[in-house]
Amino acid sequence: EPTMYGEILSPNYPQAYPSEVEKSWDIEVPEGYGIHLYFTHLDIELSENCAYDSVQIISGDTEEGRLCGQRSSNNPHSPIVEEFQVPYNKLQVIFKSDFSNEERFTGFAAYYVATDINECTDFVDVPCSHFCNNFIGGYFCSCPPEYFLHDDMKNCGVNCSGDVFTALIGEIASPNYPKPYPENSRCEYQIRLEKGFQVVVTLRREDFDVEAADSAGNCLDSLVFVAGDRQFGPYCGHGFPGPLNIETKSNALDIIFQTDLTGQKKGWKLRYHGDPMPCPKEDTPNSVWEPAKAKYVFRDVVQITCLDGFEVVEGRVGATSFYSTCQSNGKWSNSKLKCQPVDCGIPESIENGKVEDPESTLFGSVIRYTCEEPYYYMENGGGGEYHCAGNGSWVNEVLGPELPKCVPVCGVPREPFEEKQRIIGGSDADIKNFPWQVFFDNPWAGGALINEYWVLTAAHVVEGNREPTMYVGSTSVQTSRLAKSKMLTPEHVFIHPGWKLLEVPEGRTNFDNDIALVRLKDPVKMGPTVSPICLPGTSSDYNLMDGDLGLISGWGRTEKRDRAVRLKAARLPVAPLRKCKEVKVEKPTADAEAYVFTPNMICAGGEKGMDSCKGDSGGAFAVQDPNDKTKFYAAGLVSWGPQCGTYGLYTRVKNYVDWIMKTMQENSTPRED
């Protein structure tokens, strides 16, 4: 506990001190005081450098004195024989004696008192930057006018901080400019402009004079500019050493002017202004900027338009242009958007055709559609080649974006029919010879496939069963084979309006207009065993002449059995209608004269007993197309006959082409593309 005064006596004082003693006293007076230590008696064994016995006075790490021997006062009015004055509030006194004393020594008596120190003058380092004021037990610092005492209560500085500049243009100078700036000051100025403007600082070299750097290059006084995480400076010296125009790229700038205690100069003056934040003219590939400028600044808006074949994809939506705004941070809005090549996507598949998987589906890519040859061909032309257009569609030169249509090739059997022997008198056939042949199982009859959705047959086949079950693609009509073939399901039966419906069909003598169409529920898939027959053209080329040959096929009665198990066929010549009239009806249901013969009927047969018979009805009388010898067309349909194995009558299909086309058009369902 600090005290203001005290007494220190050697051991056994005033008796002789003992040998081999070491004793210390720690003196402490209150802070702000020094210590005056004085000895009134001193009697210690004398030795060189007081090596044997001694009293030692230590202040901190410094030995203030070491005493031995005998002393007496020089002043008769004062008992003090030795004294010490220290400006510190702590002192240590150490007494030591060795192992022997030649005489009897009495030691020492000493006193200490706390004394005031003058902090303003007693120390090498001046405690105050400006004015120092001493008082008993301490001191205080004070400042000249316009200066203020810092929080450390020692340093004075000018009050030059806290100014915030928000105007878009302004001037800032060091305190007292152009008079010397204050020493020992830290001046902070803040420029805060609206977002989107950058602070640009301009200085003139002659407007800058700040205490120069030391030998190590460190500025003693310094001017520093801080913009976000960027710093310009520190700057010092005579004449501004930095760039005379500083673009900070920020709307906020802190200016810090730091001075030390010495070397004041005139200082500095600067101007600043707010520049709209520039945005870089970016190179955005495959696009055009509108408007085009050399420089873009805050709030500028550009429309970036993609070149043809390129698009902006944002989410799932594709656009050809977008707007970008120069933002307050010097960056463009929508900068992530890019003009990418238009992607036409995976091309749509087409019925009965294919498109090879494209290597690329981007703008300019080319794809080719093909039909499943030889059963389908491209109806609407265009060659099947499409390119990815700028609008994101696959486009064909002829069809535009319309997809190609693969339609069945008609009238071309995969294998030609060859008569192996002498239907009645006919030959075994394969369904590949007559891929258009349709089998009706109730009643047992035939028909001809004319396209994906339509079957042509005789009216008398379907008049009693408007929901016939049909089969295609099988040579044999055994149940086991039909189970593995394609069954066709009817949607609607259209009987020619000229066909007379009878209450007792068995007694029919008039087979005029014996023609009907069956619309199918589902399209038929074509292949080697299923493929349509062509319809006759309307030109005179398709008028039949006597002797013209045609092919008939079916599973009707043969010489051997009532129903053929495997398809039979025969080649027959067209004959004059009178030949059919002349044949006696085998099992007449009326007078021979009652049977009607019209120009809507073709008479054919009469050669080698080859003829159609019961169960062949509705099948095609197929004739080679006069304009394309590779194809067959349905010139007739098996209708009726006076007697199997003689001549037969066939519905003349050419006379019904208009009705067929009209019926199909009026009852077609739009293709589900």
Partner: antibody, heavy 125, light 107 residues
Amino acid sequence: EVQLVESGGGVVRPGGSLRLSCAASGFTFDDYGMSWVRQAPGKGLEWVSGINWEGGSTGYADSVKGRFTISRDNAKNSLYLQMNSLRAEDTALYYCARDEQLGGNHYYYYYMDAWGKGTTVTVSS
Amino acid sequence: DIQMTQSPSSLSASVGDRVTITCRASQGIRNDLGWYQQKPGKAPKRLIYTASNLQSGVPSRFSGSGSGTEFTLTISSLQPEDFATYYCLQYASYPLKFGGGTKVEIK
């Protein structure tokens, strides 16, 4: 040439079982239905059972229903008749015969156009 | 079940005779009827199918007719090899039924 050869006949006690087989050749077996017909000594023909081309449809005479089972293995071109709970009145010459079925939805049957020579089954204690 | 009644059960005839055998169905069977010939110790052989259709390879002296419930097998001129037992078979529905048979013997 169409050939049907029956086997598996023999003597069996009442209540016993037998399995008859019919091996087919000379035609596409799985295109045809098949029938079993029997003839008791000195008696007329009696249809026993029939099966369609793929085995999905079968029929039986009232006299054997619940005791006999007809089946076929198209891979082996074979027809079978499993006879259980045999009775004395089942004693007969058993024939297998070929049946033709035409049409896909509306059927036309042509039964028993070819026959085997038969196999004899005797049920006796 | 449909029952088939065949008559006569037997008949005697001479070579060259015209022979007629009748089969009657207990209910209408359209034309789903066949005729079979069986000789002693042999398997039956089909002569006629679908009431009137002659089996391939069968002589044309054999013919069938009828529809519904009444059916006839006719041998226009009996030949020595025709002496046998004849059966009708209905196959309009399961269970199939044979007639009782007609034995044609030499007079």
